[in-house]
């Protein structure tokens, strides 16, 4: 007997669709081999109609597809616009039609019930709302209005204008009679169930003068929308459930192996821990629609997702839903990068953020994911230079290295900086990525004074000590502003071989401001980099005073070598909807820092890479 299994008989009516699910043992070979749906002819041959390799016969063009679900060991054949000619004997199978593993399926397409003349057909998804329109003549305006459901030869009263409601429709049906002059009444049925399917009869009045109108109500289960996204990318589920449930709690859930639906996120504050740091539920619009964004897609995120509305914030039969089948493509265009970046208290991190390289002109952003309620991600910095006030002097977004990657540097780290951050642009939303910053034990590698007070008109030297492991790196000083960090001109005074050998006396790069002006006040960063790839940074604030005061307080660089090597990079991920950037509900507007003034003039500022002995300090 064949290990392939499916429905033995499928019956439907003309014009409808069928979705035939075939099961196979999910061995490695079976998962990747050809899947097919073929029709058995009189000769015994089975002619392929659709296959997993993309073939679709002319008879099925535009109305059928075959989708493989290798992780479940199933494939599904969808056939729409059925006609009676589709009735026949078929096989779903693996491999070659003539000698593969297969299962016989009988498909019967009938004409469907003969509908009375003038019948209006209503086709609605489960859980949604239907409004049945019932016209009547003037003489029946004052008379009883009613809706019946035809079951076999009998008619069962569903609702009437005398306040009767059939118990099967309790709390989800209403009959509306308009004001004078409008010769039509309507029956609205909410939260449709499959059992509501059938033929209905509107009636106004009684006896031979009564008005009647037939309505055929077809209630269907929603077909899942197929969604293909890249590994490390992101997906947005847009959920529009209708005004009827605008004020009801919303949810997104994932169907599990037991075919129940586990809540991923809902508007009541529930969130699956597997999605921590990489999910947002965008607050709903007035029409009740909302969207859920998941970044950092993993292979295990694949599956069937349902969004819906119910006061409990979870799936309940008879309430509206929308369905998606998510596939995660492992051959991703989004570059692989660490999902966690580690830094030490007082130290720094440099995060590499990927973006679509075709969109180099797009605006770049970095936001902090906050898990409260439905999640939000207020912007911290953007490429146009706006920085949130509390990040002044310690956060910068750099366009380097370019060609599909930008860099975000955050220094003066504290334990409060631990958390999840998202890289995003106003371009291709599929390139949104997420990274977790973790604060670990250790000392910063770069040592600078805690604060510096400079005297107007005098010369200022600021030392920055670095460990031997950075000897081959390029060192720099830059002046921070909310539009970036402007590198200051470098003056290498020490012999280059001193750095190569990493002499005890050569592990220092100093900044000289000569003479100090008012414009020199502000934040300065000492940093290391390799080409366009940034490493650690250390920040120092320079205050400028009129009268002569003691210069700088020097921080001993003891244990400078002890801090661990810092991982640079972030996790690649993917989308939120385009409008998210402009959407103040997703990215709450925050106060931004004003520009900190002119950059330090190049002629007055210099970076000196020289012996630490000359600075009056030593590093062990």
């Amino acid at each position: 007997k064949s290990p392939v299994f499916g429905p033995q008989e499928v019956s439907s009516v003309e014009g409808n669709s069928v979705s035939i699910k075939c099961y196979y043992p999910p061995t490695s070979v079976n998962r990747h081999t050809r899947k097919y749906w073929c029709r058995k002819g009189a000769s015994g041959r089975c002619i392929t109609l659709v296959s997993s390799e993309g073939y679709v016969s002319s008879n099925y063009a535009g109305r059928a597809n075959l989708t493989n679900f290798p992780e479940n060991g199933t494939f599904v054949v969808n056939i729409a616009q059925l006609s009676r000619d589709d009735s026949g004997h078929y096989k779903c199978g693996l491999g070659i039609n003539s000698r593969g593993l297969s299962f016989d399926v009988s498909l019967e397409v009938s004409q469907g019930p003969e509908l009375p003349n003038g019948t209006e057909v209503y086709t609605v998804d489960v859980g949604r709302t239907v409004t049945i329109k019932c016209p009547f003549k003037t003489e029946n305006a004052p008379k009883t209005k009613a809706l019946y459901k035809k079951i076999g030869q009998t008619s069962v009263l569903v609702i009437d204008s005398r306040n009767y409601v059939n118990p099967n429709y309790k709390d989800r049906i209403r009959l509306r009679i308009p004001g004078t002059g409008q010769l039509i009444f309507t029956v609205v049925i909410d939260r449709l169930r499959l059992s509501d399917h059938g033929l209905y009869l509107c009636q106004a009045g009684d006896g031979s003068n009564r008005d009647e109108k037939n309505a055929d109500l077809q209630v269907l289960e929603p077909e899942p929308e197929l969604v293909y996204e890249d590994l490390r990318g992101s997906v947005t589920f847009h959920c529009a459930l209708g005004l009827e449930v605008a004020n009801v709690a919303k949810f997104l859930c994932r169907v599990n192996s037991r075919e129940t639906c586990d809540v991923v996120i809902n508007t009541l504050g529930k969130r699956d821990s597997a999605f921590e740091g990489r999910i947002l539920l965008n607050p709903q619009d007035k029409d009740g629609s909302f969207s859920v964004v998941i970044t950092g897609l993993r292979k295990e995120d694949e599956g069937r997702y349902l969004c819906g509305a119910h006061s409990d914030g979870q799936l309940q039969e008879g309430w509206p839903i929308q369905a998606w089948q998510l596939f995660v493509n492992e051959e991703s265009t989004i570059p692989r990068s660490p999902t966690v970046v580690k830094g030490v208290a007082g130290g720094s991190v440099a995060v590499l953020c990927p973006y679509n390289p075709k969109e180099s002109q797009s605006l770049k952003y970095w936001c902090l994911w906050e898990g409260a309620q439905n999640g939000r991600c207020p912007l911290l910095v953007e490429s146009q230079g706006l920085v949130q006030e509390q990040y002044e002097g310690r956060l910068s977004l750099l366009q380097e290295p370019g060609n599909g990657t930008f860099t975000v540097i955050l220094n003066q780290l504290t334990t409060q900086d631990a958390g999840f951050y998202w890289c995003l642009t106003n371009g291709d939303t599929r390139w949104r990525t997420t990274v977790e910053i973790k604060i670990i034990e250790g000392e910063p590698n770069l040592k600078v004074p805690g604060n510096v007070t400079a005297v107007l008109g005098e010369t200022l030297n600021i030392p920055c000590h670095f460990p031997c492991k950075f000897s081959s790196y390029e060192k720099y000083w830059c002046k921070w502003s909310n539009t970036g960090c402007q590198t200051l001109p470098s003056q290498d005074e020490g012999p280059s071989e001193a750095f190569v050998n990493c002499d005890e006396n050569s592990r220092l790069v100093s900044l000289t401001l000569n003479p100090v002006t008012r414009a020199d006040e502000g934040w300065y960063w000492c940093g290391v980099k390799q080409g366009h790839f940034y490493g650690e940074t250390a920040a120092v604030y320079v205050a400028v005073e009129e009268k002569k005061v003691a210069g700088s307080r020097y921080v001993s660089p003891a244990k400078a070598d002890a801090a661990p090597d810092e991982k640079v990079l972030d996790s690649g991920v993917r989308e939120i909807e385009n409008k998210a950037i402009q959407d103040p509900r997703l990215f709450a507007e925050e106060k931004v820092v004003a520009d900190t003034g002119d950059q330090a003039g190049g002629s007055r500022a210099s970076v000196d890479s020289s012996s630490s002995e000359e600075q009056g300090g030593s590093s062990k």
Epitope: P7, V10, V18, S19, I20, L194, S195, C261
Partner: nanobody
């Protein structure tokens, strides 16, 4: 969940027929996938047949061992699912259970774990 009550079991000779019924309480019966399973003494519960209606089409499934002999059907108006058993064999002797799988999703109909409501069972004995 729906409540399920089976009936129609009994003693029958090999080659004979029986019709099992499963009456469901609950207004949402039509949206459930319904299945029949059986369990012979000392054996595991095994899938017999299932039926699923999605509002537009009906899907019938059956185990290889009963193919061509047993037919599953349902009457949504009566909240009932039936199992017509023809050409019965002694190896069909077992307790037969009706089960319901909740909407809106239907998994592998052969897997008992995908059903959340079960009846008490009705005994079918086929003598040779």
């Amino acid at each position: 969940q729906v409540q399920l009550v089976e009936s129609g079991g009994g003693l029958v000779q090999a080659g004979g027929s029986l019709r099992l019924s499963c009456a469901a309480s609950g207004r949402t019966f039509s949206s459930y996938a319904m299945g029949w399973f059986r369990q012979a003494p000392g054996k595991e519960r095994e899938f017999v047949a299932a039926i699923h209606w999605n509002g537009a089409s009906t899907y019938r499934y059956s185990a290889d061992s009963v193919k061509g002999r047993f037919t599953i059907s349902r009457d949504n108006a009566k909240n009932t699912v039936y199992l017509q058993m023809n050409s019965l064999k002694p190896e069909d002797t077992a307790a037969y259970y009706c089960a319901a799988s909740p909407p809106p999703t239907v998994g592998d109909v052969r897997d008992p774990a995908n059903y959340d409501s079960w009846g008490q069972g009705t005994l079918v004995t086929v003598s040779s």
